[in-house]
């Protein structure tokens, strides 16, 4: 005789509001096997028992959390299999404060994840990112956990808030930081991310404290993302303080991003281009001073930007945006530099 449970995992994470069926079956050489579920608040209709099998329907309610056991017996032999069911809630509802950061101020940034379950610090972790790396030097203040106001009765959901005191963001300040919230569940890791833009000064910032006079590139995403992966979690590496970052694109994986090149022969022209497949367009969205004072040419996956009248490129941040997706690449051009590329 054989005893089978499908899905076979001993731990199952179920998103709130989604349903899951766990089928327990047993074949029996000596007649029909008796199979049943026990150990769960199996209200009417959640268990369907058939000859030789029993189907447990989990409806994604928080009350479904528990460890039901399927028991199968055939003659004098019996088998059992327990399934730890965790119903979780992790909607993409991140709220950051302030809405944008001001360089040069000692400030606190907060990130709140709403309607969370379980509200367990061991399951939920917050990170403040610069590019794809943790922001070095940020000081984590005490986390806060509060019950959300519920419209209907039931197991309460929570909101979790993490605050950080920011270190100096360097000169020039990066275009954005990101709050990343990760929920780690059995065989499942979920991540949401929210951008916190940094207010860019209209005056030309000082170049970063790098040893070379290369352009300074930082990529940033303007969209929130949620990813689900298996158990192979890569921890985020520690980053050096911002001014020590090398002048290159920070993100080597993840979404395809536009690239910015400089062309000296064309009289200090910048070219932004995307090579992410058909239907992608790019456009310039930020330049020192007023973007309207620059000469722009946009042609699908390529966009050029040059100074009017022709002359050296103005010192400061340039930003190119790719659509669809909203991915951006930022290039810092120090004064009087040798041309380089963001690739």
């Amino acid at each position: 005789q054989s005893f089978q449970v499908n899905p076979p995992e001993s731990e199952v994470a179920v998103a709130m509001g989604t349903s899951l069926q766990i089928t327990c079956s047993m074949s029996c050489d000596e007649g029909v096997a008796r199979v049943h579920w026990r150990g769960l608040d199996t209200s009417l209709g959640s268990v369907q028992t058939l000859p030789g099998s029993s189907i447990l329907s989990v409806r994604g309610m928080l009350s479904d959390t528990g460890t039901p056991v399927c028991v199968g017996s055939c003659g004098s032999r019996s088998f059992q299999h327990s399934v730890k069911i965790l119903v979780y809630a992790f909607p993409d509802q991140l709220v950051v404060s302030p809405e944008f950061l001001v360089p040069g101020q000692d400030q606190v940034v907060s990130c709140t994840a709403h309607n969370i379950w379980p509200a367990d610090p061991n399951s939920l972790s917050f990170a403040l990112l610069l590019g794809e790396q943790r922001l070095e030097g940020a000081q984590a203040l005490e986390p806060e956990q509060e019950e959300e106001i519920q419209e209907a009765e039931g197991t309460p959901l929570f909101r979790m808030t993490q605050r950080w005191r920011l270190p100096s963001l360097g000169t020039p300040a990066p275009p954005a930081l990101h709050c990343q919230v990760t929920m780690q569940l059995p065989k499942l890791v979920l991540t949401h991310r929210k951008e916190i833009p940094v207010l860019q000064s209209q005056t030309s910032p000082k170049p970063p404290n790098t040893t070379s006079a290369e352009p300074y590139i930082l990529t940033s995403s303007s969209t929130a993302e949620a990813v689900s992966t298996g158990l192979n979690i890569t921890t985020l590496p520690s980053a050096p303080p911002y001014p020590k970052l090398s002048p290159r694109t920070l993100s080597s994986e993840g979404p395809c991003r536009p690239k910015i090149h400089q062309d000296l022969e064309a009289g200090w022209e910048l070219l932004c281009e995307a090579s992410c497949g058909p239907g992608v367009t790019v456009r310039w969205t930020l330049a020192p001073g007023d973007l309207a004072t620059y000469h722009k040419r946009e042609a699908g996956a390529q966009a050029w930007l040059s100074v009017l009248p022709p002359g050296p490129m103005v010192e400061g941040w340039f930003q190119c945006r790719q659509d669809p997706g909203g991915e951006v690449t930022n290039l810092y051009v120090p004064g009087q530099v040798t041309p380089n590329s963001s690739s």
Partner: antibody
Framework: EVQLLESGGGLVQPGGSLRLSCAAS????????MHWVRQAPGKGLEWISY????????NYADSVKGRFTISRDNSKNTLYLQMNSLRAEDTAVYYC????????????WGKGTTVTVSS | DIQMTQSPSSLSASVGDRVTITCRAS??????LAWYQQKPGKAPKLLIY???SLQSGVPSRFSGSGSGTDFTLTISSLQPEDFATYYC?????????FGQGTKVEIK
């Protein structure tokens, strides 16, 4: 010269109250987060509370939460610690300390004031 | 909370000796670590911040190293005024926490 000077310590009975003050000079007080740190006789240092420059953020160690209140008066360049429901284990030297913006270590400390809780 | 553990708890040394004190954090604090010196009846005095940066006015015989969870304070050549208790402190996250202290005594 940057200076912090605590006052207000003394002998108090269990269950009693005391208010400590820390007078700051030589720097722009409102620009700095401030802390209270204590040291029981013969023991190590224990952080107990902070307050942000604008008083918007405060926090307490679990050992004093609900009993102690930190506050500041930026117009008077003074930090306060209101201590209620005092216990014998609160007996310590209480230091105020300044927190370095952007780096967050405590770079300037006062000389301390002694609080003794005993019947 | 992040626990900070110093070793040794006390040590005896002579003037001119090289002294090393270690501090271990229960989880990574990156480089958000400070070292303080305290003499009896006095307030703590900052020696090292950001794990290895020497505070202004502190003699260069004091140095700090390490990152993540393991840190070291070294006094290259112990002077008579260095006999004191030394504390490490993490300020990566609240509550900020101190090590239990290392008392450096005269041999």
């Amino acid at each position: 010269e940057v200076q912090l000077l605590e006052s207000g310590g003394g002998l108090v009975q269990p269950g009693g109250s005391l208010r400590l003050s820390c007078a700051a000079s030589g720097f722009t007080f409102s620009d700095f987060w401030m802390h209270w740190v204590r040291q029981a006789p013969g023991k190590g240092l224990e952080w107990i509370s902070y307050i942000s420059g604008s008083s918007g953020y405060t926090n307490y160690a679990d050992s004093v939460k609900g009993r102690f209140t930190i506050s500041r008066d930026n117009s008077k360049n003074t930090l306060y610690l209101q201590m209620n429901s005092l216990r014998a284990e609160d007996t310590a030297v209480y230091y105020c300390a300044r927190d370095r913006p952007y780096y967050y270590y405590m770079d300037v400390w006062g000389k301390g004031t002694t609080v003794t809780v005993s019947s | 909370d992040i626990q900070m553990t110093q070793s040794p708890s006390s040590l005896s040394a002579s003037v001119g000796d090289r002294v090393t004190i270690t501090c271990r954090a229960s989880q990574s604090v990156s480089r958000s670590l400070a070292w303080y010196q305290q003499k009896p009846g006095k307030a703590p005095k900052l020696l090292i911040y950001a794990a290895s940066s020497l505070q202004s006015g502190v003699p260069s015989r004091f140095s700090g190293s390490g990152s993540g969870t393991d840190f070291t304070l070294t006094i290259s050549s112990l002077q008579p005024e260095d006999f004191a208790t030394y504390y490490c402190q993490q300020y990566k996250s609240y509550p900020v926490t101190f090590g239990q202290g290392t008392k450096v005594e005269i041999k």
